[in-house]
Amino acid sequence: ALDAAYCFRNVQDNCCLRPLYIDFKRDLGWKWIHEPKGYNANFCAGACPYLWSSDTQHSRVLSLYNTINPEASASPCCVSQDLEPLTILYYIGKTPKIEQLSNMIVKSCKCS
Amino acid sequence: ALDAAYCFRNVQDNCCLRPLYIDFKRDLGWKWIHEPKGYNANFCAGACPYLWSSDTQHSRVLSLYNTINPEASASPCCVSQDLEPLTILYYIGKTPKIEQLSNMIVKSCKCS
């Protein structure tokens, strides 16, 4: 799996999970989230050569097409596969509210 | 939806469905498929600015992050959303076989 266990331990130019810390205030301009101040969102990036963690038959076809037609702009892209939620604390007036934001943290990637 | 009805009728630099005809023999080197000789596979391509058909909360966060930090390499990618199968005819010896290959045709796209 193209997850932290594999990607963070290997230098990998191909599609892999990349570390990304996002500070809500600095990076998103969000002032409403009290805690956490930021989180390890991670992201997916890297090349998608033929058979490198292809998600569908179409992405396999597309990566093979791209191998044979390297000048073509059609190629699969490295995107998130498994995502996890993030629990946040914010305030409405002086009342604390806890909410789970779904699909906030990328745990693994795929070529799609 | 970023499908043919929208994308093929508009000049769109942002993430959209793009037409792509794949000839099995010429483009993939596949000689085993008897019919069809090729098919409209289509593909997804284009920029993923903030809120442009974001797939998940993470892709929305990432596109906003990319807006505020344009020099960053972290950004969502335009990939397939809805896919359809393709029915093919091939031979094993002289015996014709009909098979449905799943997820071969892209019908719409998303930023993920």
């Epitope: 205030k25 002032k31 009290h34 805690e35 956490p36 101040k37 989180y39 390890n40 629990t87 | -």
Partner: antibody, heavy 117, light 102 residues
Framework: QVLLVQSGAEVRKPEASVKIFCKAS????????MNWVRQAPAQGFEWMGQ????????NYNGKFKGRLTLTADTSTNTAYMELSSLRSTDMAVYYC??????????WGQGALVTVSS | EIQMTQSPSSLSASPGDRVTITCRAS??????LAWYQQKPGKVPKLLIY???NLADGVPSRFSGSGSGTDFTLTISSLEPEDAATYYC?????????FGGGT
């Protein structure tokens, strides 16, 4: 590398005020929260408050309400902590510490404040 | 405010021993907890952030576990230089209180 350099030791009389500075370098000062923490002699730690230098936003420990003022000068990358109406129980080492990823990852060297009549 | 209770308050162990320190929060703090090491006369050093993540430059014999209200700092094989006071701190709503130290 990240460096937080604090002002030296201070001696103050009861009811006086003390202002400690913390000069930051090696990172984007305006875009990280700065925490202030104190440690009384042979005691544990007490979180006092935090400031976001980029916009001056602050969060204070209610215990110090009205006595604690946190400020930041973005032109010199310096954070300030001022504590007024000092009492003997305020004698402690005062630290500034950068907030990062659910922790304080870099700390200043500490500034000892002695309160004595 | 959230109370952080650390145990034991002190412990004695030998080089090579496996040592466990626990920290309990008075309410759910999810994974918003850090562990620090402080040696006499020195500045605290971050060991673990976000409950389980090892800070840069910290030896792999240190590890953190737990979420919610119960957290553990483990030193898998004690080294003489690990003699110090260890503190936990939560980061789930201000004030960010500390444990009493071990």
């Amino acid at each position: 590398q990240v460096l937080l350099v604090q002002s030296g030791a201070e001696v103050r009389k009861p009811e006086a005020s003390v202002k400690i500075f913390c000069k930051a370098s090696g990172y984007s000062f305006t875009s990280s929260w700065m925490n202030w923490v104190r440690q009384a002699p042979a005691q544990g730690f007490e979180w006092m408050g935090q400031i976001y230098p980029g916009d001056g936003d602050t969060n204070y420990n209610g215990k110090f309400k009205g006595r604690l003022t946190l400020t930041a000068d973005t032109s010199t990358n310096t954070a300030y902590m001022e504590l007024s109406s000092l009492r003997s129980t305020d004698m402690a080492v005062y630290y500034c510490a950068r907030h990062y990823d659910g922790s304080t990852d870099y700390w200043g060297q500490g500034a000892l404040v002695t309160v004595s009549s | 405010e959230i109370q952080m209770t650390q145990s034991p308050s002190s412990l004695s162990a030998s080089p090579g021993d496996r040592v466990t320190i626990t920290c309990r929060a008075s309410e759910n703090i999810y994974s918003n907890l850090a562990w620090y090491q402080q040696k006499p006369g020195k500045v605290p050093k971050l060991l673990i952030y976000a409950a389980t993540n090892l800070a840069d430059g910290v030896p792999s014999r240190f590890s953190g576990s737990g979420s919610g209200t119960d957290f553990t700092l483990t030193i898998s094989s004690l080294e003489p230089e690990d003699a110090a006071t260890y503190y936990c701190q939560h980061f789930w709503g201000t004030p960010y209180t500390f444990g009493g130290g071990t």
